[in-house]
Interface confidence: low
Amino acid sequence: LEIGRFDPERGRGAAPCQAVEIPMCRGIGYNLTRMPNLLGHTSQGEAAAELAEFAPLVQYGCHSHLRFFLCSLYAPMCTDQVSTPIPACRPMCEQARLRCAPIMEQFNFGWPDSLDCARLPTRNDPHALCMEAPENA
């Protein structure tokens, strides 16, 4: 099942949206998220702890939208119209992996299983919502 399927029931029973509190994920084009996120973290604090591991990579700048992509999984966009978190689309993931995985290897990192691009929707459509690369994130 792809992440981000549209729910006509408008999120009945889903956790409410909450303000993005993770410093790395502020000012990226949306400001509401929902927990648990797409990686199973139940709180933003828990998500932030893992996300911080990528800080050197974001600073390195291997991919212009890496921060946006990571935040789309760790603090995915939330809207009251959709019951599930909305991740980035697969092409953004694949570009980030292509450019950043070789750099990660230099830092003794492997590209994490949790960032498996195959789990993400191929493109944004009403049946599998996802976010395209932003203009200026």
């Epitope: 604090g45 932030a48 702890a49 893992e50 911080a52 591991e53 800080a55 050197p56 600073q59 290897e105 830092f107 003794n108 990192f109 492997g110 994490p112 299983d113």
Partner: antibody, heavy 118, light 107 residues
Framework: QVQLVQSGAEVKKPGSSVKVSCKAS????????ISWVRQAPGQGLEWVGR????????NYAQKFQGRVTITADESTSTAYMELSSLRSEDTAVYYC???????????WGQGTLVTVSS | EIVLTQSPATLSVSPGERATLSCRAS??????LAWYQQKPGQAPRLLIY???TRATGIPARFSGSGSGTEFTLTISSLQSEDFAVYYC?????????FGQGTKVEIK
């Protein structure tokens, strides 16, 4: 390349606490992940927990939850591991190491022997 | 938690011979597995990360392979300084876990 230097050996009484330090030099400390791993005499390696200094957020192995506190001082690039309610089975060499989530451990500190004995 | 089982517990090998060490995970760890060497009285030293990538300064006689649940560390021609204990470790999920170790001793 980061280098990690640990504090010296400690002898403690059962029920007391110990605080071991790990000073980093030669690389980014704040955005690193610093883990603590222990090794009882003649035994294997056991992960205790880790901290990301820039966040101050620590994760602990379930076994040590409630007894261990890992902290970091960014101003001195030093990580600390405090273990309380010590018992004889806590006698071990405690290592700090860089890494600990999606990352292997490298480098390692030289180790600190903590002996718990009455 | 993910359990890593190393085999054999002890491996007796003559210098110059090939040594093959195994590490099996109770569930998939992808390629997020490392190998360490530890000599008496010393801290562990990273040999292999990402299941197959040699760490900086590690001789080419050390190689790692595998993914998922089955991993192998191979030392192609044992030197005297290679006799030590070897540990595998997964960094795919919490809690981080180590294998129990394989001791490589002189035959």
């Amino acid at each position: 390349q980061v280098q990690l230097v640990q504090s010296g050996a400690e002898v403690k009484k059962p029920g007391s606490s110990v605080k071991v330090s790990c000073k980093a030099s030669g690389g980014a400390f704040s955005t690193s992940s610093i883990s603590w791993v222990r090794q009882a005499p003649g035994q294997g390696l056991e992960w205790v927990g880790r901290i990301i200094p820039v966040l101050g957020t620590a994760n602990y192995a379930q076994k040590f939850q409630g007894r261990v506190t890992i902290t970091a001082d960014e101003s001195t690039s030093t990580a600390y591991m405090e273990l309380s309610s010590l018992r004889s089975e806590d006698t071990a060499v405690y290592y700090c190491a860089k890494g600990g989530w999606r990352s292997s451990f490298d480098p390692w500190g030289q180790g600190t022997l903590v002996t718990v004995s009455s | 938690e993910i359990v890593l089982t190393q085999s054999p517990a002890t491996l007796s090998v003559s210098p110059g011979e090939r040594a093959t060490l195994s590490c099996r995970a109770s569930q998939s760890v992808s390629s997020n597995l490392a190998w360490y060497q530890q000599k008496p009285g010393q801290a562990p030293r990273l040999l292999i990360y990402g299941a197959s990538t040699r760490a900086t300064g590690i001789p080419a006689r050390f190689s790692g392979s595998g993914s998922g649940t089955e991993f192998t560390l191979t030392i192609s021609s044992l030197q005297s300084e290679d006799f030590a204990v070897y540990y595998c470790q997964q960094y795919n999920s919490w809690p981080l876990t180590f294998g129990q170790g394989t001791k490589v001793e002189i035959k």
